[in-house]
Interface confidence: medium
């Protein structure tokens, strides 16, 4: 008897075991969240584990499918969207991938009503893009490059553009570079917020220099993939405005809004586009060089059936340290007088914080302020502003909400997520139904992750939406490794960094020692997130350390961190993976002998050089799909961090960043070099360009590359590539397989 | 151009009543909290009394809880302030605000003035 518990506390610690490479690589310990689709105050609709499409009232609590999932079967559907006025739901499949964000699909109307698919004026396919109006059922699509319009889903079309040519002229949609650079989305068309008018762009790509690869198939000859891509000082596309009247789009047709004055005198992107109301649009450009961003606020003219933006309502934003914003501009988000707004800027500080804006960005009220940031603007409603932001004890990676009460005196702060699950979540985003009457909560970490539901009124919590709670059960009787998030102090800088640390984890021994690098500019790589990925595996079954480090040009820490890569790339944010790795050394647990360093895209970059500094400090490295050049990257982001590749700007810069430039510096390391040849972001070329140069300096060194595959490595490349890179790191670090 | 007109100060004895208004103007009126703040020869400029948009929430500093009452009709663009029991310290010049923002007053009336004395 007395004996049992010590038996079963044995035959629990026999029962544990390590996280291994299979695990990851079939996903086993992936967890789920729930974000609602919001279709009321107080009403969402979500798909259920059976794909029938179910809608749920909160103040009822009933819930009743709208769409059962053998109609979603009839068509093979993976995705729905119901128009505002509920009688029809649009079921989208045969979804074809194209870039980031970007796919075609072939689009069903399905007639709520009468429990049929909609016959006559079928959509043609595939189609680019396809969205409701807000209010009511019309329909915006985007085919073959032209924007169409249907007045209700059996209409016949009309057809907005013409001019829409493949890699020529894209209306609706972006271009390569603004998908990916700019707008971050696979649209460039929005609704007024009563479906009155449809606002849209125009990007004219004729005279962009294209980048051609070859995609290789199972075709005798392989084909070639030519995609209109502006590298560094390139010619960039040449975008316009366009905005129609919907109810009687023939009456006048598309009306182009006009460019502030200021940013039209020389080359100039648009970074975004925000309805105010029906009649009201604020639109957002940029100079190429973005350190001046002019937000223009724009009314409808009915005598003239125009648009005319006075220069009294353009609000300038300029940087005097760096670029505008901080990976891209932030949006405004209005308030209910239609002319007032509030937005995210840095103080005079330099901390990106709430501002609201009346009449001039000069007499800005700031409204949060601290050396912490504000990172994005919820919801705003009559009475209250939501927020998030890394306030909360003082940690820079993690995500709390806010709540500032305007409606009542005097105006108070609220934290509404920092003592909820304390241990568990520190790192939230939140979803708002109309006028913020109910949210949901979605905690990524660090602990597993939760979403809940909470009233917007008393921020009380309604239910657990999902908890993942099979995932939990998974993991008792997995070793999992230990992960811990401090700061080190280095000459006036603070470098975060999270440890991953072996689960029996021991001071006294020493251990080899993996890097995991971003280092991008405005990224963040230490947050209080959960994961059970390649890097708990390696700690959790191979016994290394893994680190990763916050430097120079990372966010979310004031300007004079971020801003700090400025027009200098590729030589702070190495700098500082070096120092960390050293103090790291001084901890007295890692084997100096035994130390390697690994990234993928702008990581793969900052490896490379960090094993090419001459240091002597890396064993080995890894880089995946690495950036070698910024004169091989597009312009929009390069330009942004790096000014123009021309003499009179930083093309001394451009030439000296390099990986070719430091070939000779691999002798001494062993470097792994891997890249998809169909990689349409950051192209092969710039592994091309770095073996090419490691073969001149005759420095031996390792290569894979996957064929016909992307910037993202997918399907069963991913398989090969982690098994090929444990392989690689066991064999540097000297790990039996 | 926002408009802001006080009326109804001035002379009264020490325990007496006064009621001020303020018609507001030029502004949409609805979306802004109201306020009346006081000005004593050689002092600073006192909040009083806050009232919300909707006029569901109020404010008053201890100095006058309980004696002022603060009130608006959003119909007529009228805010009001009830002053009870006044005392010889209340001499102020009163002026009625409108914020710009939240709590912010941007904006302010010329000011009435009201004189406590026996």
């Known amino acids: 008897i007395v004996l049992r518990p010590s038996r079963v506390h044995n035959s629990e610690e026999n029962t544990m075991r390590a996280l291994t490479l299979k695990d990851i690589l079939n996903g086993t310990f992936s967890y789920k969240t729930f974000f609602p689709n919001w279709i009321s105050g107080q009403e969402y609709l979500h798909q259920s584990a059976d794909n029938n499409i179910v809608l749920y009232n909160i103040e009822t609590g009933q819930s009743y499918t709208i769409l059962s999932n053998r109609t979603m079967k009839s068509v093979n559907a993976s995705n729905y969207g119901l128009s505002p006025d509920r009688q029809f739901v649009y079921l989208e499949s045969d979804y074809s991938k194209l870039w980031r964000y970007s796919y075609t699909a072939t689009y069903y109307i399905y007639d709520l009503s009468n429990g049929e698919f909609v016959r006559g004026n079928e959509l043609p396919r595939p189609i680019q893009y396809l969205c409701w109006s807000p209010v009511g059922s019309k329909l915006a699509y985007v085919y073959q490059n032209n924007i169409y319009l249907k007045q209700r889903p059996g209409d016949p079309p009309f057809q907005i553009t013409f001019n829409g040519r493949e890699n020529k002229i894209f209306n609706g949609i972006p271009d390569w570079v603004y998908e990916e650079e700019m707008l971050a989305t696979k649209y460039a068309l929005w609704w007024s917020p009563n479906g009155k008018f449809l606002a849209y762009a125009e990007f004219n790509d004729t005279d962009i220099p294209v980048i051609a690869y070859s995609y290789y198939g199972d075709e005798q000859y392989p084909r070639t993939i030519n995609i209109p891509y502006p590298k560094a000082g390139a010619k960039n596309p040449v975008v316009r405005i366009f905005i129609i009247d919907t109810t009687y789009p023939a009456y006048v047709g598309p009306q182009e809004v006009p460019v502030p004055a200021m940013i039209a005198s020389s080359d100039y992107y648009f970074s975004w586009l925000t309805w105010v109301t029906d009649e009201r649009v604020c639109l957002q450009w940029l100079k190429r060089v973005q350190n001046v961003s002019v937000l223009s606020i724009c009314d409808f003219r009915e005598d003239w059936q125009t648009w005319d933006c006075p220069k009294t309502q353009e609000h300038i934003e300029e940087s005097r340290t760096g670029w505008a914003g901080g990976f891209f501009v932030s949006t405004p988000v209005f308030s209910y007088d239609a002319i007032s707004y509030y937005k995210i800027f840095s103080d005079k500080d330099g901390y990106k914080h709430i501002h609201y804006i009346k009449d001039t960005v000069e007499n800005a009220i700031q409204i949060t302020s601290g050396k912490w940031e504000a990172i994005n603007i919820f919801r705003v409603t009559q009475d209250s502003l939501f927020y998030s932001s890394n306030e909360f004890e003082e940690y820079p990676g993690r995500r709390n909400i806010y709540r500032i009460s305007i409606g009542s005196y005097p105006p108070s702060k609220k934290c509404v997520t920092c003592h909820l699950r304390k241990e568990r979540c520190q790192y939230y985003t939140a979803s708002f139904s109309d006028y913020a009457k109910y949210y949901a909560l979605v905690c990524y970490g660090p602990g597993i992750p939760i979403s809940t539901l909470h009233d917007g009124r008393t921020d009380q919590e309604i239910k657990i939406l999902e908890e993942n709670k099979e995932l939990e059960n998974a993991l008792k009787n997995i070793q999992l490794p230990k992960e811990e998030i401090k700061k080190l102090e280095v000459d006036e800088i603070t470098l975060w960094y999270k440890m991953i640390l072996p689960p029996q984890f021991d001071r006294s021994k020493k251990y080899p020692l993996l890097i995991q690098v971003y280092g991008g500019p405005c990224s963040q790589s230490v947050r209080s997130v959960f994961a059970v990925n390649w890097i708990s595996y390696l700690a959790s079954k191979e016994g290394m350390v893994i680190a990763l480090v916050d430097g120079r040009g990372t966010a979310f820490q004031g300007d004079k961190l971020l801003y700090a890569v400025y027009r200098k790339l590729g030589v702070y944010e190495v700098e500082d993976q070096i120092t960390a790795v050293r103090k790291f050394i001084e901890m007295g647990f890692i084997d100096e002998k035994r130390i390697a360093i690994w990234g993928w895209s702008y990581g793969g970059y900052v490896s490379s050089l960090a094993l090419a500094s001459g240091t002597g400090l890396f064993k080995c490295g890894i880089a995946v799909a690495p950036v070698s050049s910024w004169e091989y990257y597009a312009s929009v982001y390069t330009e942004r961090f790096m000014g123009l590749p021309t003499k009179d700007d930083n093309l001394e810069h451009y030439k000296n960043s390099t990986v070719m430039a430091r070939a000779e510096y691999f002798r001494n390391v062993d470097y792994l070099l891997i890249h998809g040849t169909a990689d349409d972001n950051v192209h092969f070329q710039n592994s091309a360009q770095i073996a090419k140069a490691l073969v001149n300096a005759q420095v031996d060194f390792q290569a894979m590359w996957y064929s016909d595959q992307n910037h993202g490595l997918s399907g069963l490349s991913t398989n090969h590539l982690y098994t090929h890179m444990t392989h690689f790191l066991k064999q540097c670090f000297s790990l039996s397989d | 151009e926002v408009q802001l007109v006080e009326s109804g100060g001035g002379l009264v004895q020490p325990g007496g009543s006064l009621r001020l208004s303020c018609a507001a103007s030029?502004?949409?009126?609805?979306?802004?909290?109201m306020g009346w703040f006081r000005q004593a020869p050689g002092k600073g400029r006192e909040l009083v009394a806050a009232i919300s948009r909707t006029g569901g929430s109020t404010y008053y500093p201890d100095s006058v809880e309980g004696r002022f009452t603060i009130s608006r009709d959003n119909a007529k663009r009228m805010v009001y302030l009830q002053m009870n029991s006044l005392r010889a310290e209340d001499t102020a010049v009163y002026y009625c605000?409108?914020?710009?923002?939240?709590?912010?007053?941007?904006?302010w009336g010329q000011g009435t003035q009201v004189t406590v004395s026996s």
């Open positions: 030029g502004f949409i009126y609805g979306y802004n909290h």
């Open positions: 605000a409108a914020a710009e923002f939240q709590w912010h007053f941007g904006y």
